[in-house]
């Protein structure tokens, strides 16, 4: 009598997540009488996948009718495959008895599940930083299989090199995640810059998945301040200008102080954007020189994006002022300045 063979013809089967997997199994003989069962894994911890006689296996269906007479095909189809279904599946023949006795197992079919990575999500720093500082961006993608994946970072199309990437877990798993951190040195020109995280995987039809972040969310460009005085008007009024240039974001409050007392406070709004994404703003203050007996200390105080205020100050000498002024005069452009205009 020829010994019964349990034939699993495929050593391995690959399937895409969401598809169905067919696991083939035939037996060479109808005897001895007894059921066929499918298991995932071997040994005492194996998991029952399908048993015709009992149990509820909603995702598993027999390929051919197992109740038909002389049936020797015990192939099964598992629907809606997920990465968690990966493993080695064994078709096992039992001899009928009380209880049934395991007689012979097939060689096993390894089911590998290919799953696409999720769209990469890029997150930037929690607080803004200024030019010359380094900020970190993180990119994450999950749920892919097999483990092999490539991740690249780009800033304005140029690949970044200061990158640290990890794929988890390190060992064998049903699916994997990737997390990468890129360190970017900011420049004043980065308001319109963009970082891109690009993920390539065997399941993607040639084009990598991309996640993006705008450096505008991460950068603060502090303003330059310049205070100038226009020509003296006939009515003894001096027009003083505070030019606030090249700042980002737009959130800015400007306060004029005369001899330390608040004269006027303004909030920047609806400013036109410069080509590089920064903003400029000009504020004017009319000072009636004849109303003052002593020199007037004028201060333009700018508070940008919640940062400590920056001041520009200068003094207007009230006595012996000429009626006409030939040229504009500017306060110096750094720190807190006092400058005699006359």
């Amino acid at each position: 009598e020829e010994e019964l063979q349990v034939i699993q013809p495929e050593k391995s089967v690959s399937v895409a997540a969401g598809d169905s997997a067919t696991l083939n199994c035939t037996v060479s003989s109808l005897i001895p009488v007894g059921p066929i069962q499918w298991f995932r894994g071997a040994g005492p911890g194996r998991e029952l996948i399908y048993n015709l006689k009992e149990g509820h296996f909603p995702r598993v269906t027999p390929v051919s009718d197992p109740t038909k007479r002389n049936n020797m095909d015990f192939s099964i189809r598992i629907s809606n495959i997920t990465p968690a279904d990966a493993g080695t599946y064994y078709c096992v023949k039992f001899r009928k008895g009380s209880p049934d006795v395991e007689l012979k197992s097939g060689a096993g079919t390894e089911l590998s599940v290919r799953a696409k990575p999720s769209a990469p999500v890029v997150s930037g720093p929690a607080v803004r930083a200024t030019a010359e500082h380094t900020v970190s961006f993180t990119c994450e993608s999950h749920g892919f299989s097999p483990r092999d994946i490539t991740l690249k970072w780009f800033k304005n199309g140029n690949e970044l090199s200061d990158v640290q990437t990890n794929v988890d877990p390190a060992g064998k798993s049903v699916s994997y995640s990737i997390r990468s951190t890129a360190r970017v040195v900011l420049t004043r020109r980065d308001v319109h810059s963009q970082v891109i995280c690009e993920v390539a995987h065997v399941t993607l039809q040639g084009d990598p998945l991309r996640g993006t972040a705008n450096l505008s969310e991460a950068i603060r460009v502090p303003p330059f301040l310049e205070v100038t005085q226009q020509s003296m008007r006939a009515d003894n009024q001096v027009n003083v200008t505070c030019q606030v240039t090249k700042f980002y974001p737009q959130r800015l409050q400007l306060t004029w102080l005369e001899n330390g007392n608040v004269s006027r406070t303004e909030m920047a709004s609806a400013l036109p954007e410069n080509k590089d994404g920064t903003y400029n703003w000009t504020s004017w203050l009319l000072v009636n020189v004849s109303a003052h007996r002593d020199d007037v200390k004028l201060t333009c105080q700018v508070e940008h994006d919640g940062q400590p205020a920056v001041n520009k100050s200068f003094s207007v000498k009230v006595s012996a002022h000429p009626k006409e002024q030939g040229s504009n005069t500017a306060a110096e452009n750094t720190g807190t300045n006092e400058r005699n205009i006359y």
Epitope: S14, V15, A16, R114, D148, V202, L204, Q205, G206, D207
Partner: antibody, heavy 116, light 109 residues
Framework: VQLVESGGRLVQPGTPLTLSCTVS????????MGWFRQAPGKGLEYIGI?????SPYYASWVNGRFTISKTSTTMDLKMNSLRSEDTATYFC?????????????WGPGTLVTVSS | DIVMTQTPSSVEAAVGGTVTIKCQAG??????LAWYQQKPGQRPKLLIY???TLESGVPSRFKGSGSGTDYTLTISDLESADAATYYC???????????FGGGTEVVVK
């Protein structure tokens, strides 16, 4: 699902030539497609692929001599300044549904002969 | 580019016999290896992908194995219809490029 190459013929060295691969039964916007060639009596050689969105990638030896492009139903291989060593049967192929690491559907090929 | 070294270049075996073809990659290709069969004047036909997964409709007499850099195609119970040239093809997931082995001609006596 079918692929058919066309455009192969006898040309003189230095002549440009464009081959086409016409597909049916699936959408070119869903799969990576590739071009390969096989010189008489020799093995298979990879030329390049075009991604589902239309981005081409080439073997390092191509050096800008060949250009791959596509429309909704055809993929083209534009060959500049052909040489005698470009004489080969040119195949187009589609990657498998599970990934880009293998090609499961191939066209019958079209013969390009470069000779004076 | 990855170089694929396929051996032997030619092999002869009798009907019912077994043939083993080896393919070695210049660096690890993480099981991204396919095997094709090509008969004279015909297009290549996919047999196996991902090192060991049998393409639908291909007889189970064709078996692929291997990992890392070394891969094997075994054809058992040889039939006269198996006479053909067999090619291995790699895909490298980092460079995303393809390479073929030089081919093995199988002659069935």
């Amino acid at each position: 699902v079918q692929l058919v190459e066309s455009g192969g013929r006898l040309v003189q060295p230095g002549t440009p030539l464009t081959l086409s691969c016409t597909v049916s039964g699936f959408s070119l916007s869903s799969y990576v497609m590739g071009w390969f060639r096989q010189a008489p009596g020799k093995g298979l050689e990879y030329i390049g692929i075009i991604s589902s969105s239309g981005s081409p990638y080439y073997a390092s030896w191509v050096n800008g001599r060949f250009t791959i492009s596509k429309t909704s139903t055809t993929m083209d291989l534009k060959m500049n300044s052909l040489r005698s060593e470009d004489t080969a049967t040119y195949f187009c192929a589609r990657v498998g549904p599970l990934g880009v690491d293998y090609f499961n559907i191939w066209g019958p090929g079209t013969l390009v002969t470069v000779s004076s | 580019d990855i170089v694929m070294t396929q051996t032997p270049s030619s092999v002869e075996a009798a009907v019912g016999g077994t043939v083993t073809i080896k393919c070695q990659a210049g660096q690890s290709i993480n099981s991204y290896l396919a095997w094709y069969q090509q008969k004279p004047g015909q297009r290549p036909k996919l047999l196996i992908y991902y090192a060991s997964t049998l393409e639908s409709g291909v007889p189970s007499r064709f078996k692929g194995s291997g990992s890392g850099t070394d891969y094997t195609l075994t054809i058992s119970d040889l039939e006269s219809a198996d006479a053909a040239t067999y090619y291995c093809q790699s895909w490298h997931y980092i460079s995303r490029s393809y390479a073929f082995g030089g081919g093995t001609e199988v002659v069935v006596k």
